[in-house]
């Protein structure tokens, strides 16, 4: 019977032979035939000989061919096929016979060994994946592992082993992504061949065309568009262009791949047209495709016959900004091609040379950190030299300034000044701003609070009243005036409020405003009837047994928590001792008074007495000290004894009894041992030290005695007063 397919001398689908042996394979068929060999067997190999088909078999009507492979090697393992040569009349399906030859070698269980660098195997999730670790013997047991320590075990369904093909994974998943290795142990020796599965994705991350749209060119120039497609590492793309001249193949297109990025692939397609013409203007589209993924990017190309410049104001010709702004953009509306050279002038000079704060950005001049110096005329100069085109346009910039009050910026005192009661005061605000600010003066009255918990207070947010020279609010105003002055090279307005008579405490405010904003300076106007707002007085230096009387007066707007303390120095440290039984402080119109009375003082009460009050504004405790030295007591003594004395009737006389002692002695007068009281005609002088008798009569004659007494004792002196002449009562009457 005729052989529909060639017949091989080795029967079956596979045959195992040992390495080093000779493979002898004969093919017999009805027609001329050829051999197909594994890729690892080279037709030029000296060890291989194939006889051309020659007549054989019954009646020499068959064709026979012999394949001989001397000293076969492990890598000669594979499929050997004998097939009929196709004829022009033959419409049969391919007629062939194959046998898989295993060239077994214990030293080379794998046909291909990938040890130094793993072999890359592309995979698509959900599709079949073959890890091609083919073996040289069907009996070799192979294990598939995934680095570092997973084992992929054949289950006969999803993962199967085929000694001719390797491991077949029916539908690959992410679990098969990685460094895989096939392991086989032969005669106690471990063999490994490595594969790196590479998942192919269709992820196009980005498509861009450079230069950005619109692309402008002059007739005759070269158009170069670079389309860049960024993809995941495992993505490959096809790139194509649509453009006006595509039908006539106007452009040349070059493609390249940039693999220098560690986590992406970047594909480039560069379109180039030399000597562009009007017909090349229009839409250029770069199309990027990867599997089912597609992205495109458009750019528009304009081709101009010749250059042009047109410039207009983007805003008004006169623009305003404010000093202190982080930046201001002076911008012009420019249409020009090709890109002109740009120079900005400020008041006729190149702006960027004037200040590093001036930056040119496109057709804009950006002024950083605007100041008043930036006011002026700005001119944009535009020039296209090759086209001999030049244009310019000027804009004026006004820099407005929010009002500033100079006195606010100079460091103010931590606590407000005090204005003496009844004094004339001049209050000044020096103001600067553009436009020139309007200045008004305001009055905020103080609110009195007579409760014990709260002190009188003034606040800035209370009701306020606008003042004019005729205002009768608060204090009498002498004048409100304004004058211009140049300070540090700038025009400033000095506004002056003159208070004629300081009587009423409150807050004066000068308010300066223009269209940019308002600023206010508050001047706390605290009137004081106490010198420097804090005064301590001692009635007199007491002697032992007398009363000590101290008085402390503080300005009520500046101080609170008033108290008397006694300072004592112990071991070089000053101790503050509180004094008990202090009286309540009393509040008056402008001040708080605290009196301290210590009755019947002794020498131990000597010391430094201090009045302490807390400054409301600084929180600081202020002390005013006074030294008290209690004088030692001393028995009275007379500076001069009384002496007998004669006086004429109807005359007048003075008896003097000057005594000293500590405390100052009390003086008592006696006449004939009877205490003298002041009565008409008898006058006791200061401290009873003098006795004055007017219109002396006979009855005034007698023994006069003065006694000086204090705690320490008493002393006395006596004298006889003689009245000369007789009394003429009738005449008197």
């Amino acid at each position: 019977s005729k052989l529909k397919v060639p017949e091989l001398s080795l029967k079956g689908t596979q045959h195992v032979m040992q390495a080093g042996q000779t493979l002898f394979l004969k093919c017999r068929g009805e027609a001329a035939h050829s051999w197909s060999l594994p890729t690892t067997v080279s037709q030029e190999d000296k060890r291989l000989s194939i006889t051309p088909p020659s007549a054989c078999g019954r009646d020499n009507r068959q064709f026979c061919s012999t394949l001989t492979l001397d000293t076969a090697q492990a890598n000669h393992t594979g499929l050997y096929t004998c097939r009929y040569l196709p004829t022009s009349t033959s419409k049969k399906k391919k007629a062939e016979s194959s046998i898989y030859i295993f060239v077994s070698d214990a030293g080379s269980p794998f046909i291909e060994m990938h040890t130094d660098i793993p072999k890359l195997v592309h995979m698509t999730e959900g599709r079949q994946l073959i890890i091609p670790c083919r073996v040289t013997s069907p009996n070799v047991t192979v294990t598939l592992k995934k680095f570092p320590f997973d084992t992929l075990t054949p289950d006969g369904q999803r993962i199967t082993w085929d000694s001719r093909r390797g491991f077949i994974i029916a539908n690959a998943t992410y679990k098969e992504i990685g460094l895989l290795n096939c392991e086989a142990t032969v005669n106690g020796h471990l063999y490994q061949t490595n594969y790196l599965t590479h998942r192919q994705t269709n992820t196009i991350l980005d498509v861009q065309i450079r230069p950005p749209s619109p692309v402008r060119l002059l007739h005759g120039q070269t158009l170069v568009l670079n389309c860049t497609a960024t993809t995941e590492l495992n993505t490959r793309v096809q790139m194509s262009w649509n453009y006006p001249g595509k039908a006539t193949k106007r452009a040349s297109i070059r493609q390249r791949i940039d693999r220098s990025h560690s986590h992406n692939n970047v594909f480039h397609s560069v379109l180039k047209i030399n000597n562009v013409e009007s017909r090349d203007k229009g839409l250029y589209t770069c199309r990027v495709k990867s599997g089912s993924s597609f992205q495109s990017f458009n750019t528009s190309v304009h081709v101009y016959e010749k250059g042009f410049i047109s410039v207009k104001h983007r805003k008004q010709p006169v623009q305003e900004t404010t000093a202190g702004r982080r930046s201001y953009r002076l911008s012009m509306k420019v249409k020009a091609f090709p890109s002109p050279e740009i120079v900005w002038l400020k008041d006729g000079s190149p702006a960027t040379l004037k200040s590093a704060r001036y930056l040119v950005h496109g057709y804009s001049l950006i002024i950083k950190d605007v100041t008043t110096e930036d006011a002026g005329d700005y001119t944009i100069l535009l020039g296209i030299k090759q086209s001999r085109l030049f244009k310019n346009l000027t804009a004026t910039l006004i820099v407005n300034v929010k009002p500033q009050i100079y006195e606010k910026s100079v460091s103010s005192l931590p606590s407000p000044p005090l204005y003496p009661l009844g004094s004339r005061q001049v209050l000044t605000c020096t103001v600067y701003g553009i436009p020139r600010p309007t200045i008004t003066w305001l009055w905020h009255p103080c609110h009195h609070n007579h409760s014990k918990e709260r002190y009188d207070f003034c606040t800035e947010n209370e009701e306020s009243f606008i003042l004019d020279p005729s205002s009768n609010l608060g204090n009498r105003i002498e004048s409100i005036s304004q004058r211009m002055t140049v300070i540090e090279g700038t025009n400033k307005t000095v506004s002056t409020l003159v208070v004629a008579d300081s009587q009423t405490p409150g807050i004066y405010s000068c308010r300066a405003f223009n269209k940019i904003g308002t600023v206010e300076r508050n001047i706390k106007f605290y009137v004081t009837d106490v010198p420097n707002g804090f005064h301590v007085s001692l009635e007199k230096m007491p002697a032992e047994g007398e009363d000590l009387k101290l008085s402390c007066v503080v300005n009520k707007f500046l101080y609170r928590d008033i108290t008397w303390i006694l300072l004592r120095t112990v071991n070089n440290r000053t101790m503050h001792h509180s004094i008990s039984k202090q009286k309540m402080a009393t509040t008056q119109d402008y001040s708080i008074t605290l009196n301290l009375v210590i009755k019947n003082v002794s020498l131990e009460d000597s010391g430094t007495y201090a009045c302490r009050a807390r400054n409301i504004y600084t929180g600081e405790d202020i002390l005013r000290k006074t030294e008290v030295l209690v004088r030692d007591s001393e028995a009275p003594h007379l500076l001069q004894n009384l002496s007998d004395y004669e006086v004429s009737i109807s005359g007048s006389t003075t008896l003097d009894c000057q005594a000293r002692g500590v405390p100052a002695p009390q003086i008592t007068w006696f006449k004939n041992n009877h205490k003298i009281q002041q009565e008409p005609g008898i006058i006791l002088g200061p401290g009873n030290s003098t006795l004055f008798i007017e219109r002396v009569t006979e009855e005034d004659e007698g023994v006069y005695r003065c006694r000086a007494t204090n705690q320490k004792g008493a002393v006395e002196s006596a004298a006889y007063l003689t009245v000369q002449g007789t009394s003429d009562k009738s005449n008197l009457e």
């Epitope: 570092p148 320590f149 992410y174 990685g178």
Partner: antibody, heavy 119, light 111 residues
Framework: EVQLLESGGGLVQPGGSLRLSCEAS????????MNWVRQAPGKGLEWVAT????????SHAPAVKGRFTISRDNSKNTAYVQMNSLRAEDSAVYYC????????????WGRGTTVTVSS | QSVLTQPPSASGTPGQRVTISCSGS????????VYWYQQLPGTAPKLLIY???QRPSGVPDRFSGSKSGTSASLAISGLQSEDEADYYC???????????FGGGTKLTVLG
Amino acid sequence: EVQLLESGGGLVQPGGSLRLSCEASGFDFSTYAMNWVRQAPGKGLEWVATINSEGTITSHAPAVKGRFTISRDNSKNTAYVQMNSLRAEDSAVYYCSSTTGTTHGMDVWGRGTTVTVSS
Amino acid sequence: QSVLTQPPSASGTPGQRVTISCSGSSSNIQNNYVYWYQQLPGTAPKLLIYFNSQRPSGVPDRFSGSKSGTSASLAISGLQSEDEADYYCGTWDDSLNGWVFGGGTKLTVLG
């Protein structure tokens, strides 16, 4: 951008516990094995633990076996190491590392988080 | 004591070629791929060589790696001052079932 960010380090007393986290972004976290590597001050790199892509197989260095446990949560793109019975010699900068799939070495590293074990 | 052995230090002048060796055993270097890492002061390690001799993108071709049996080496040609760093070799160890590293080599660029 491919990134690993460790957190959870700090000062702990001997015998105490800490849990370090490593959050991944910018790559296919669930596909690759994750590692923890530590470096004591002035010393070299020391492998601590590795976990496979699915979180089903782990391996720990002998010095930490029984005390440290590596784990991962692929839904959160985060790997962890639970450290118990800490000792002074565990003080180090702890790095987590992975691969983005080309090299299968440690081609992605975090900045590290410092663990100090001291009383 | 590290599983892989590296010299603790190496040095060279700019432009010179330096080689750092790394020796191991059959359970690690011989049967697995060798990786080299560069660690600049105060930073995390960076992969320099993978699969014995391959360079990740961005690593200059002045760096090359090789492996033979149970040893591996890293060569740096045309030495530059920015190459001053610690260099570590690393590989998988089948018996440990984990990664192993060398003790590190401190490379100093002289002058």
